[in-house]
Interface confidence: low
């Protein structure tokens, strides 16, 4: 019995035309939603003038349907048993699942001012930037609609820069009509224990953002894992959102719509400083903001974002060091709401439910030459928003899964 089941599973999880896995892999049968909470700054003037703590109030959720598009350019390579594809991006606003509209206004850090002052730190160019910032009536903070903030707006300060530069700014700009990849993953035909594991991303086995092992593209994309998952396993996966590979560990058994699944979570150790977790030494790319690599819980992904000072963390700086959240008032981290988990059906390795949570932050630093930043007396890693991307297997799919997979085994 067991051998027959193993054989059937092995056959059905291969990523090739005609298998259950392939059909769901090309176009997910699960509805995936991305909820955003925006950190609305309550005291912009006090921060700019007195370097006060930033008081934020989260507003959300604002919900978008995502990952509804089928993979594109799906190409099998029989020689190395891989399949390559592009994952197209698309987001559709869901008013019924949101607290407001895409036209809602928020007071947030001025993305262009923060980024330009970080990229161009030379005093001379900062004097030029200062005159352009003043001329465009830009400030340290700005008021933007949700739509502008997420998907892009033409920045008045950048529009004055006298050389060709992208004047459109947005946390996820460009998004719609773009694609992530090319991914090339093992299809499992020759070795089922490698199925869905990424061979190359954008034609490379490394990212070129980090040093040493931190730069490796490990594991799958987290949508599925090789079958016969054990509780003792450390599940590696790559997330282009955070420009790195990361891992999850077993936390508990969960019953999902009658299907026994293993809940794997991203442990706090994955976000620890190299002092606590020496493996993380290569995620510390500079010594000043990180206080000689002793700060933890924030990841500087500026190398992956054309030098823009973007820092990724868990929502509300969950698992981050006190020095990171100290200048920000209004944050309330809690594990239940803010950690990331994957519910994996162990026989097939399919992720049947997940919640991917992350926070996007921008670094802003004092600058003697830029008037709107010159009263700052410290560096701030400013939270802009956090997101919760979730997906759960539908009832119909769950019934089918129960009858075809778990029912047969039990």
């Amino acid at each position: 019995g067991d051998l027959l089941i193993q054989k059937t599973i092995k056959k059905q999880v291969v990523l090739e035309e005609g298998t259950i896995a392939f059909k769901n892999w090309v176009k997910t049968g699960t509805e995936v939603y991305r909820q955003f909470w925006i950190f609305d700054v309550q005291n912009p003037q006090e921060v700019m003038m007195n370097s006060s703590n930033i008081q934020v109030k989260q507003r959300g959720p604002y919900t978008y349907r995502v990952r509804f598009l089928a993979k594109e350019n799906v190409t099998q390579d029989a020689e190395d048993n891989t399949v390559s594809f592009l994952q197209p991006n698309g987001a559709i606003f869901e008013p019924s699942l949101s607290v407001g509209t895409e036209a809602d206004n928020f007071t947030v850090l001025n993305l262009a001012v923060a980024a330009a002052s970080h990229i161009y730190q030379n005093q001379f160019v900062q004097m030029i930037l200062n005159s352009l910032i003043n001329k465009s009536k830009s400030s340290m903070f700005q008021v933007r609609t949700l739509r502008e903030l997420l998907w892009g707006y033409r920045d008045p300060f950048l529009s004055l820069v006298p050389y060709p530069v992208t004047t459109t700014v947005g946390l996820f700009y460009p998004y719609n009509n773009t694609a992530d990849g090319v991914y090339k993953v093992f299809n499992g035909k020759d070795n089922i224990s490698k199925v869905a594991i990424i061979d190359t991303y954008k034609g490379k086995r490394n990212l070129s953002y980090w040093e040493s092992h931190c730069d490796m593209i490990n594991g799958t994309d987290a949508a599925s894992f090789p079958p016969f998952v054990e509780k003792s396993q450390v599940l590696q996966f790559f997330s282009s959102d955070i420009c790195r590979s990361i891992y999850a560990v077993f936390e508990s058994d969960v019953n999902l719509k009658g299907i026994p699944v293993y809940r794997f979570v991203l442990p706090s150790k994955a976000f620890a400083s190299p002092v606590e977790n020496p493996d993380n030494y290569c995620f510390c790319t500079e010594k000043i903001i990180s206080k000689n690599c002793t700060s933890y819980g924030v990841l500087d992904i500026s190398k992956c974002k054309e030098g823009r000072p973007v820092y990724i963390s868990l929502p509300h700086f969950l698992y981050a060091s006190p020095d990171v959240s100290e200048p920000i008032d209004g944050l309330n981290p809690n594990e239940e709401e803010h950690r990331t988990y994957l519910d994996i059906e162990p026989i097939t390795g399919f992720t049947l439910q997940f919640a991917k949570r992350l926070q996007v932050n921008l670094l802003v630093k004092p600058s003697e030459k830029i008037q709107v930043l010159k009263n700052l007396k410290r560096n701030y890693i400013v939270p802009i928003l956090w997101l919760n991307e979730t997906g759960t297997i539908g009832d119909e799919k769950a019934n089918m899964f129960r009858s075809q997979v778990t029912g047969k085994i039990n």
Epitope: H118, I119, Y120, Q121, N122, Q123, F124, V125, I128, V161, P162, Y163, V165, K287, I288, K303, G307
Partner: antibody, heavy 122, light 107 residues
Framework: QVQLQQPGSELRSPGSSVKLSCKDF?????????MTWVRQKPGHGFEWIGD????????IYGEKFEDKATLDADTVSNTAYLELNSLTSEDSAIYYC??????????????WGAGTAVTVSS | DIVLTQSQKFMSTSVGDRVSVTCKAS??????VAWYQQKPGQSPKALIY???YRYSGVPDRFTGSGSGTDFTLTISNVQSEDLAEYFC?????????FGGGTKLEIK
Amino acid sequence: QVQLQQPGSELRSPGSSVKLSCKDFDSEVFPIAYMTWVRQKPGHGFEWIGDILPSIGGTIYGEKFEDKATLDADTVSNTAYLELNSLTSEDSAIYYCARDYYGSSYGYFDVWGAGTAVTVSS
Amino acid sequence: DIVLTQSQKFMSTSVGDRVSVTCKASQNVGTNVAWYQQKPGQSPKALIYSASYRYSGVPDRFTGSGSGTDFTLTISNVQSEDLAEYFCQQYNSYPYTFGGGTKLEIK
């Protein structure tokens, strides 16, 4: 590996001019990083000549070099240039280009060219 | 202009010793000081930035310290390959200026 490539030497006669090149092999960083030029004269230590930001062509010069040096850059070939005019024997020195590896323009430099030795002699 | 003075033009030391190279600024430069090593016939190599932060790949026997006007580069357990000239540089304000250099000789 070489990131900033400079010619080894240039010989010029007094009163003439010379244009020194510095090719950057990091095309991603070149436009956004300040390229700094310094010179080293035996017994005089290092002197800062000036900076150029290739993406906007913005320049700043040391007072001593305002009438002596002209900085420019070509973002197609990722090359920065330093032109020295009205050469005298006082301009004989090694001229270095330098920048920060990540393109952060703080004013310290961990990527240096090998230097071009300029000799002014009749 | 800010003048950086490296009072000792030459310093003599032995392999395994500890040596300190000093640099004094004519006015407060905060911690905006870098240190470079230059071997004969070579371009400078960056050792330290922001007064005390070591560049990756620089051996940990090189340590920078100081702020304001007084700065020190300390080499503990001197090795024969440390025979070189050491320069400080300030980038607190234009024009950037360099110290006159300290030549380290190995006895």
